[in-house]
């Protein structure tokens, strides 16, 4: 999916008002310095591409993020503010959701959500030069 036509400011507002809090809740009990940020993004469409991938694509050691509250809210925000997103992405992620077992918070998942927090922070500051 090409995130170029999304309403970035509305997505940012949804992140600040609700998604960010759910990410913090998920990470509660984890030190902010525990994980290094290894995933980066260069602009807002690129950030959303990486956020989409890390949130909904199963990875080795962490296959359950799509059921988390922050993931459902991310999906809703993208469905609302990115025209055409639902048709191209939702059915695929729903199929994956059905295949998943119960929620398990592994260290790998915590690391992945830490990466997500970094991507969202970068999304919110699009004018900053890439480090």
């Amino acid at each position: 999916y090409d995130f170029t036509n999304c309403d970035f400011e509305k997505i940012k507002a949804a992140y600040l008002s609700t998604i960010s809090k759910d990410l913090i809740t998920y990470m509660s009990g984890t030190k902010s310095t525990e994980f290094n940020n290894t995933v980066s993004c260069s602009n807002r469409p690129h950030c959303l591409t990486e956020i989409q991938s890390l949130t909904f694509n199963p990875t080795a050691g962490c296959a359950s993020l799509a059921k988390e509250m922050f993931a459902m809210k991310t999906k809703a925000a993208l469905a609302i503010w990115c025209p055409g997103y639902s048709e191209t992405q939702i059915n695929a992620t729903q199929a994956m959701k059905k295949a998943r077992k119960s929620k398990v918070t592994t260290n790998k998942c915590l690391e992945q959500v830490s990466q997500l927090q970094g991507l969202w922070r970068r999304f919110n500051r699009p004018l900053l030069k890439q480090q």
């Epitope: 509305k10 949804a14 998604i19 025209p83 055409g84």
Partner: antibody
């Protein structure tokens, strides 16, 4: 069962406000969109706006911006639509309608409708 | 945002097919594959018959089909039955600030 149940008919004076409720049951309220659509006597359908409780997002039709307020109480699975500065042209049946999960613009479940009559 | 344009009436005999058109612009029907159709019997709430241009919700007979070409969407009812007599409304998404604009409605009469 899966349903939307709306509050009863209202008669209002011009210039006043009306608040219509829509109670959901049988499905996960927060995940869907709750849209409001009205139909004046003998006329077609007109979309007023939507709320997606999961993310607390409300979107209003440009025509009703500033005059309509849509809210939701997730603890009671109830959505509300308040229309202010009523005029006779606002006389209509007001429907709440469920927008499909992540496809909030397709209305797959409707309330029974609430007749709002604006008359002096 | 202007309403979509539908013919006010359409008719057909039992067993026949009838097609109802719905014309919009590149800002709505032409710009998105997010067209839906609703059936409304007198005094009742509307019912979703077609969504995403041509998909049918479960429980809707396959006699109902939808299509789109350019800025015009169409609903076809084949093998007309008496219970198909109703008003039909098309709807289209028209951007992130307009989830639905409706057509004026078409009264379908089964002769």
């Amino acid at each position: 069962q899966v349903q939307l149940v709306q509050s009863g008919a209202e008669v209002k004076k011009p210039g006043s406000s009306v608040k219509v409720s829509c109670k959901a049951s049988g499905f996960t309220f927060g995940s869907y969109g709750i849209n409001w659509v009205r139909q004046a006597p003998g006329q077609g359908l007109e979309w007023l706006g939507v709320i997606v409780p999961l993310v607390g997002v409300t979107i209003y039709a440009e025509k009703f911006q500033g005059r309509v307020t849509i809210t939701a109480d997730t603890s009671t699975s109830t959505a509300y639509m308040e229309l202010s500065s009523l005029r006779s042209e606002d006389t209509a049946v007001y429907y709440c309608a469920r927008g499909q999960e992540y496809f909030y613009w397709y209305f797959d479940l409707w309330g029974q409708g609430t007749l709002v009559t604006v008359s002096s | 945002q202007s309403a979509l344009t539908q013919p006010p009436s359409a008719s057909g005999s039992p067993g026949q097919s009838v097609t109802i058109s719905c014309t919009g612009t590149t800002s709505d029907i032409g710009g998105y594959n997010r067209v839906s159709w609703y059936q409304q019997h007198p005094g009742k709430a509307p019912k979703l018959m077609i969504y995403e241009v041509s998909k049918r919700p479960s429980g809707v007979p396959d006699r109902f089909s939808g299509s789109k070409s350019g800025n015009t969407a169409s609903l076809t009812v084949s093998g007309l039955q008496a219970e198909d007599e109703a008003d039909y409304y098309c709807s289209s998404y028209a951007g992130t600030d307009t989830f639905a604009i409706f057509g004026g409605g078409t009264k379908l009469t089964v002769l």
